[in-house]
């Protein structure tokens, strides 16, 4: 064996955003015929000799960063990419609004404003159906997400979350959905 074994993948099902009280399973997937898996939680570092972790009831203490590796013979794989498991619903939901309006003519600009009842400094915007998210660190109670030159692709349902950078894996409940309609 020359060099480390390829890294496995670590995924959360159904999602890595988990409302408090709900269940989630983390699963480490390596190549076929893996001898043994190790699943680690970081900060503080601890580990289990399993290829999965079932969390029946999401709690604040479950939130954080996870990674996994596997062993074949006496060789270890590279570690998986880290998975950030987020507990949502820890704080009250922010409000999400569109300015000047949630009905926007194509080619115009619109700003989605996420506003929290708390003095949080981090905000995240999700669009339904998209895999990525838009993070914006801001100071105090609000964050603006400008969308320049709107196209039909921007149509859809948006939600935002707020949290404190000092507890980056403990998020608010999601805002009520905002439907952005691109006209013309």
């Amino acid at each position: 064996q020359s060099g480390p074994l390829p890294k496995p993948s670590l995924q959360a099902q159904p999602s890595s955003l988990v409302p408090l009280g709900q269940s989630v399973i983390l699963r480490c997937q390596g190549p076929p015929d893996v001898d043994l898996y190790r699943l680690e939680k970081l900060k503080p570092e601890k580990y289990e000799d399993q290829d999965f972790l079932f969390i029946p009831t999401m709690e604040r203490s479950n939130a954080g960063r996870y990674r996994c590796s596997y062993q074949n013979g006496s060789h270890w794989s590279l570690p998986s990419d880290q998975l950030e498991l987020i507990a949502t619903g820890v704080y009250a939901k922010p409000s999400l609004s569109a300015h000047p309006s949630s009905a926007v003519p194509q080619g115009r600009d619109v700003t989605l404003k996420c506003q929290s009842p708390y003095s949080f400094d981090e905000f995240v915007l999700y669009k339904e159906g998209d895999t990525g998210s838009y993070k914006r660190p801001e100071k105090w109670y609000r964050a603006n997400f400008p969308i320049i030159t709107v196209t039909a692709a921007h149509s859809g349902t948006y939600r935002c979350y707020s949290f404190s950078s000092s507890s980056p894996y403990l998020w608010s409940a999601p805002s009520d959905p905002l439907v952005l309609v691109v006209t013309g």
């Epitope: 480390p4 190790r38 970081l42 503080p44 570092e45 601890k46 580990y47 000799d49």
Partner: antibody
């Protein structure tokens, strides 16, 4: 209270073999990872080998891989280290150490150590 | 050659403050792994002194404290006492081969 007692050390010629034992008491032995750590005379600590709570996960330091074998018998609350093809540089006090565990999780540090057993490899 | 680097010796007078450094790399301390510290009094087995960078097991005086930043860590001892004279070892974990790694040890001498 937690107790770890090593035995089996002694004088052995280069190329010879020795089997160390560690008798554990005062805790649920089968729940914990266990390790052997050694200390050459006047030198620092060197991790030698670890074994998972069920005996499946096994890791060795590069300096002993292929010569030493770690094992455990949870029914007897015992940890073992079979040392073959011994060399002068294996001369050391060998400590048995318990890894901390909390709930389902194992941690990467040693919360209890035995008093050690001396292995001398010399012709 | 130890994976983690510590100064071979430090010294201080009773009542003084001393620090012991422990430097690792991107595959151990820098990979996010915690640093733990052990005290070995002359002729005895090592004893856990600090775990998880800065936590003290019960029975360890608050004169002992630990911290970690980037790829290094340090142990501080304030109000030095004669009974603190011992060898001190840092320990972490290495991600590359999942092995446990130690520093070479630091001999603390309490002067006078």
């Amino acid at each position: 209270q937690v107790q770890l007692v090593e035995s089996g050390g002694g004088l052995v010629k280069p190329g010879g073999s020795l089997r160390l034992s560690c008798a554990a008491s005062g805790f649920s032995f089968s729940d914990h990872y266990m390790s052997w750590i050694r200390q050459a005379p006047g030198k620092g600590l060197e991790w030698v080998s670890s074994v998972g709570s069920e005996g499946k996960f096994i890791d060795y330091a590069a300096s002993v891989k292929g010569r030493f074998t770690i094992s455990r018998d949870n029914a007897k609350n015992s940890l073992y280290l079979q040392m073959n093809s011994l060399r002068a540089e294996d001369t050391a006090v060998y400590y048995c150490a318990r890894h901390y565990r909390e709930f389902r999780w194992h941690y990467y540090y040693f919360d209890y150590w035995g008093q050690g057993t001396l292995v001398t490899v010399s012709s | 050659q130890s994976v983690l680097t510590q100064p071979p010796s430090v010294s201080g007078a009773p009542g003084q403050r001393v620090t012991i450094s422990c430097t690792g790399s991107s595959s151990n301390i820098g990979a996010g792994y915690d640093v733990h510290w052990y005290q070995q009094l002359p002729g005895t087995a090592p004893k856990l002194l600090i775990y998880g960078n800065s936590n003290r097991p019960s029975g360890v005086p608050d004169r002992f404290s630990g911290s970690k930043s980037g790829t290094s860590a340090s142990l501080a001892i304030t109000g030095l006492q004669a009974e603190d004279e011992a060898d001190y070892y840092c320990q972490s974990h290495d991600l590359g081969a999942h092995v446990w790694v130690f520093g070479g040890g630091t001999k603390l001498t309490v002067l006078g």
